[in-house]
């Protein structure tokens, strides 16, 4: 079991020309809210199909009224996260739909009117228990920036929230037959189940059915904080009579922690809890770790919790860059051969092949002439994925089965008459024309534009075209 969490960072006009008009006006003030729908797997289902993993609706955002003449800014957002609880294992791959809705607050008949402003959808891989993944999606002229993560509800852990964990009994190893929950965590896989209702935050068990409390908590289920109400101050030497601490000067006075770090006292000195992106004794050093959620587009962050730790982003298909921030135009590498059409589906590349070619990259040339015969002495010619017959003289058609009519194309010019002949065609020219196709006029004085006709033929006689 666990929770999918979605944090909307901004919703406003995207970059580039054609900024959208503000969805709210002085006459119709409005506010935004968001809906998220989750489905398992990398399905390309319709928006209307059931949200099998769950759905959630945000609270309504602050009321917004457009300032006349001002371009549409980033619109005010609702507070808090959208949380989608899941009861079973986290599937690892999922599809999401995030809808931005506008609630108009003008004098609407029958209460407020709702309209869908934008809908974005995507398919991602995401391991539960990882850091926030950041994303930017565009819908028309609008741009939505958001982060998301899946976290397990204790005591479940692991990338699918299917394993149970408990603190290690010894710092270096787990008990017999128990694996570490994760190499970078000091916890062991726990097949045992604590007493029903035992607080997952403040209780633990060494044996099945028990509930032992962490320091500061008490009660049968470790849900009752140890009372310190009679103590005025949590600092200074202990008073023997009350068991309470008496004030004294503390190492956190004046807050030695830089960059917004918070100070807490330790028996010997102080400790700074640093905000994201800072580390060091006094939070004086800046650095990025997986806790800062540096990986975009569903990239998986790998790295230790220590601020000195490196991190790398394991990118899903279609993204690259040290933070998976760049979308790869994988079709620009022209992976499809033989004129195939490249389709980048995000999770995979597809090649749509031209006729006569096949294979994942259209690399296989199908033998168009295999098993095909051209009749009447024709020869088969491959080309462009379709077979073609080059026919012997006097034959035509796809397979050279048709006897060709050489006169069908009216080859004799200037009214000459065409006669089919075993070796081709013969043109009988009209008076005044000569040539194999009657293409040359005979000059009025009887001289031809061509050399003299061969012996035995006079101008006007049928000319055989061989």
């Amino acid at each position: 079991a666990g929770v999918f969490e979605l944090q909307i960072h901004s919703f406003g006009p995207g970059p580039g020309p054609g900024a959208p008009r503000s969805p709210c006006s002085a006459r119709l003030p409005c506010r935004l809210f968001f809906r998220v729908c989750l489905k398992p797997g990398l399905s390309e289902e319709a928006a209307e199909s059931p949200c099998a993993l769950g759905a959630a609706l945000s609270a309504r955002g602050p009321v917004y009224t457009e300032q006349p003449g001002a371009p549409a800014p980033d619109l005010p957002l609702p507070d808090g996260l959208l949380q989608v609880p899941f009861r079973d294992a986290w599937p690892g791959t999922f599809s999401f739909i995030i809808e931005t809705w506008r609630e108009e607050l003008g004098d609407q008949i029958g209460g407020p009117a709702w309209s869908l402003l934008a809908r974005v959808a995507g398919r991602r891989r995401l391991a539960a228990g990882g850091p926030w993944a950041r994303d930017i999606q565009r819908a028309g002229a609008w741009e939505l920036r958001f982060s998301y993560r899946a976290r397990c509800e204790p005591p479940a852990v692991g990338t699918a929230c299917t394993r149970l964990c408990r603190p290690r009994s010894a710092p270096s190893r787990c008990g017999p037959g128990l694996r570490p929950c994760a190499p970078l965590e000091d916890e062991c896989e726990a097949p045992l189940v604590c007493r029903a209702g035992c607080s997952p935050e403040h209780g633990f068990c060494e044996q099945p059915g028990e509930c032992r409390c962490l320091e500061g908590w008490t009660g049968p289920l470790c849900t009752v904080p140890v009372s310190t109400s009679s103590c005025l101050s949590p600092r200074g030497p202990s008073s023997a009579t009350t068991g309470c601490l008496v004030p004294g000067p503390g190492p956190c006075d004046g807050n030695p922690c830089a960059n917004g770090g918070s100070c807490s006292e330790t028996p010997r000195s102080f400790e700074c809890t640093c905000p994201r992106g800072f580390y060091g004794l006094r939070c004086e050093v800046s650095g990025v770790t997986c806790a800062d959620g540096p990986c975009f587009n569903g990239g998986l962050c790998v790295g230790g919790a220590d601020p000195d730790s490196a991190y790398i982003c394991h990118c899903p298909p279609g993204f690259q860059g040290s933070n998976c921030e760049k979308r790869v135009d994988r079709c620009s590498l022209q992976p499809c051969r033989n004129g195939g059409l490249c389709l980048d589906l995000g999770h995979a590349l597809r090649c749509r092949c031209r006729a006569g070619f096949a294979g994942p990259r259209c690399e296989h040339d199908l033998d168009d002439c295999a098993g095909r015969a051209c009749a009447n002495g024709g020869t088969c010619v491959e080309g462009g994925g379709a077979h073609r017959c080059s026919c012997a003289l006097g034959f035509g058609g796809r397979d050279c089965r048709e006897r060709a009519d050489p006169c069908a194309a009216r080859p004799c010019a200037h009214g000459g008459r065409c006669y089919a002949h075993f070796s081709g065609l013969v043109c009988a020219c009209a008076p005044g024309y000569m040539g194999a196709r009657c293409e040359f006029p005979v000059h009025p004085d009887g001289a031809s534009a061509l050399p003299a006709a061969p012996p035995g033929l006079r101008p006007g006689d049928p000319q055989r075209y061989l």
């Epitope: 891989r125 391991a127 790998v302 790398i312």
Partner: nanobody
Framework: EVQLVESGGGEVQPGGSLRLSCGPS????????VGWVRQAPGKQRNLVAG???????NYAQSVKGRFTISRDNAKNTLYLQMSSLRAEDTAVYYC?????????WGQGTLVTVKP
């Protein structure tokens, strides 16, 4: 279960160099993110250097300029060249690989830096 095997650890003086190797292993392929994780006594495991599945490299602040990670996809092997070693580099170094579904670890090789 396929496992990663590290080699090249040992004892070295401050300022010295070592080259760690991991593999060959069918796990170390270009579609996986790989790296070197170290754990000093009493400390958390941390990623010292890594190469992502899209070829980006990153290093822990404390080793930048001194350590170099590389992979040979043809040999299915991962390397870590360590130079200008310091006492604080003393740790068990683990080879690590992962994709979206799985992560893989070696048994670790001990690097000790002492005068």
């Amino acid at each position: 279960e396929v496992q990663l095997v590290e080699s090249g650890g040992g004892e070295v003086q401050p300022g010295g160099s070592l080259r760690l190797s991991c593999g060959p292993s069918e796990i170390i392929t270009s579609d996986k993110s790989v790296g070197w994780v170290r754990q000093a006594p009493g400390k958390q495991r941390n990623l010292v250097a890594g190469i992502s599945n899209v070829g980006s490299t990153n290093y822990a602040q404390s080793v930048k300029g001194r350590f170099t990670i590389s992979r040979d996809n043809a040999k299915n092997t991962l390397y870590l060249q360590m130079s200008s070693l310091r006492a604080e580099d003393t740790a068990v170094y683990y080879c690590y690989a992962r994709d979206f579904e799985n992560e893989y670890w070696g048994q670790g090789t001990l690097v000790t830096v002492k005068p």
